[in-house]
């Protein structure tokens, strides 16, 4: 009888899943640029400051920084350029662009954001002579929303980014942490399955009873992932056991609060090329 | 290589309005760059104008008469001066910078302007 | 507007023989930045004039180093260490800290 494959295919999604935070603070299919221009999206109350930051790889000796909106016919209006700690004269003060100490970062701000700024911005660096040089960032979203009366719950703009270090510092450690917390639980999941290995008895033929609620007890709700397809890749066939579980596992995360969401089909080898959550992927394998 | 050549009448009466273009070669007028106009009056020296570079920005001895455009299409820019006296007879240049200060790489021939009756 | 006074108007100068040309600015071109935003600039007979030096003494690609530039504040120099025959023209000196950017009358440089 071939020996089964155990929680590896388990883990090994886990360590996949365990990159997702660096998806999240840094799209891996926005092109590598010289320049980048953050955050990708930014939301304002009209009236409020709105400030993007620009970032050179390296500070070359002279170049000129210029910062675009792109028009309703996809052509770049320059709103302000920014020499030697110079903004050009001449141009609208709402827009500002100012040198971080580090000299490689800078502010670009709109102060008292106008509903009608409510667009797609960039930035654009020109490396001026003997070794002139034009390159553009990726594209921002900024969005200005008009001003509500209530103060908002969370905090209208998304935090600057996160500088390189600290970055990577986050996503190691928040890999690391999920990773482990993760494989505790699926640790617990597997007992759960594969009672054998803690009971010694072969239990088939039933799933597990949904969760019952005691008279008494606080409301527990489930968020329920679906059904982990696990596709197995024996090499060899394996006889039938007798008293073998079916390929298919069940897990069911537990969130105390929570109003549960509809189950989710996913099968473990289209992990294999996992892309970060898409907006309609919900909130991923955090609550929200 | 850029080359940029200015073209345009040699004279012109006064009180009327100048006009004059500037066709690029050789590279695109885009709002990257400052597309600028300066003249050289004789026995004087050089005296900026304006620029073009997505917008305008221009020398206030000349504001209210003084008008810089661009068609990013014909790949070309252009100068109209209004009410031109004989003071305003000059080489007038159009030139390329890569900052909105007197950091000019490429400019044109000139061409000379004459104002008279 | 900054006026830029150059001294002197025209200068005859022998083959080898060293130049200078004296620029003044009405005021300060030193930036808060640290920088100072002079220029010189040279137009050879029938051609279009083209900048030699930006902020005070860098040269600009292709420009001999018999061409030097110094000075601060408001009083700056361009130096031609030993003038060659293709050197005649006349030189302008330009400011570009505060807009509108202004010229000097310029400099002929003829030789003897």
């Known amino acids: 009888m071939g020996s089964r494959r155990g929680p590896w295919p388990l883990v090994w999604a886990v360590l996949q899943l365990g990159w997702w935070p660096g998806w999240l603070l840094d799209s891996p299919d926005r092109p590598w640029s010289p320049l980048t221009f953050s955050p990708a999206q930014l939301t304002v109350q009209e009236g409020e400051n709105a400030t993007f930051t620009c970032s050179l790889a390296d500070i070359p000796d002279s170049f000129v920084l210029n910062w675009y909106r792109l028009s309703p016919r996809n052509q770049t209006d320059k709103l302000a350029a920014f020499q030697e700690d110079r903004i050009e004269p001449g141009r609208d003060r709402r827009f500002r662009v100012t040198r971080l100490p580090n000299g490689r970062d800078f502010h670009m701000s709109i102060v008292a954001a106008r509903l009608n700024d409510s667009g797609i911005y960039l930035c654009g660096a020109i490396y001026l002579p003997p070794n002139t040089q034009i390159n553009e960032s990726p594209r921002a979203e900024l969005s200005v929303t008009e001003r509500t009366l209530e103060p908002p719950t969370q905090s209208p703009s998304p935090p600057p980014r996160l500088s390189g270090q600290l970055q990577g510092l986050v996503i190691g450690v928040t890999s690391v942490l999920v990773g482990v917390l993760l494989l505790l639980l699926l640790t617990w999941v597997l007992a759960a399955v594969f009672p054998r290995a803690t009971r010694g008895a072969c239990v088939c033929g039933s799933e597990d009873e949904p969760l019952k609620e005691g008279p008494d007890a606080a409301p527990v709700f489930t968020l329920d992932y679906g059904e982990l397809d696990f596709q197995w890749r024996e090499k060899t066939p394996e006889p039938p056991a007798p008293c073998a579980p079916e390929q298919t596992e069940y897990a069911t995360i537990v969130f105390p609060g929570r109003p549960a969401s509809p189950g989710r089909r996913a099968s473990a080898s289209s992990l294999q090329g996992a892309q970060p959550p898409s907006p309609e992927d919900g909130p991923g394998l955090w609550p929200p | 290589d850029l080359t940029l050549q200015e073209s345009g009448p040699g004279l012109v009466k006064p009180s009327q309005t100048l006009s004059l273009t500037c066709v690029v070669s050789?590279?695109?007028?885009?709002?990257?760059?400052?597309w600028n106009w300066i003249r050289q009056r004789p026995n004087r020296g050089l005296e900026w104008m304006g620029y073009w570079s997505g917008y305008t920005h221009y020398n206030p001895a000349f504001q209210g008469r003084i008008s810089i455009d661009a068609d990013t299409a014909q790949n070309h820019f252009s100068l109209q001066l209004s009410s031109m006296t004989t003071e305003d007879t000059a080489v007038y240049y159009c030139l390329r910078g890569y900052i909105w200060t007197p950091d000019y790489d490429y400019w044109g021939q000139g061409i000379l302007v004459t104002v008279s009756s | 507007d900054i006026v830029m006074t150059q001294t002197p108007l025209s200068l005859s100068v022998s083959p080898g023989e060293p130049a200078s040309i004296a620029c003044k600015a009405s005021q300060s071109l030193l930036h808060s930045n640290g920088n100072t935003y002079l220029y010189w600039f040279r137009q050879k007979p029938g051609q279009s004039p083209q900048r030699l030096i930006y902020?005070?003494?860098n040269r600009d690609p292709g420009v001999p180093d018999r061409f030097s530039g110094s000075g601060s504040g408001t009083d700056f120099t361009l130096r031609i260490t030993r003038v060659e025959a293709d050197d005649a023209g006349v030189y302008y000196c330009g400011q570009g800290i505060q807009d509108p950017w202004t010229f000097g009358a310029g400099t002929k440089v003829g030789l003897k």
């Open positions: 902020k005070v003494s």
């Open positions: 050789g590279g695109s007028v885009t709002n990257i760059f400052y």
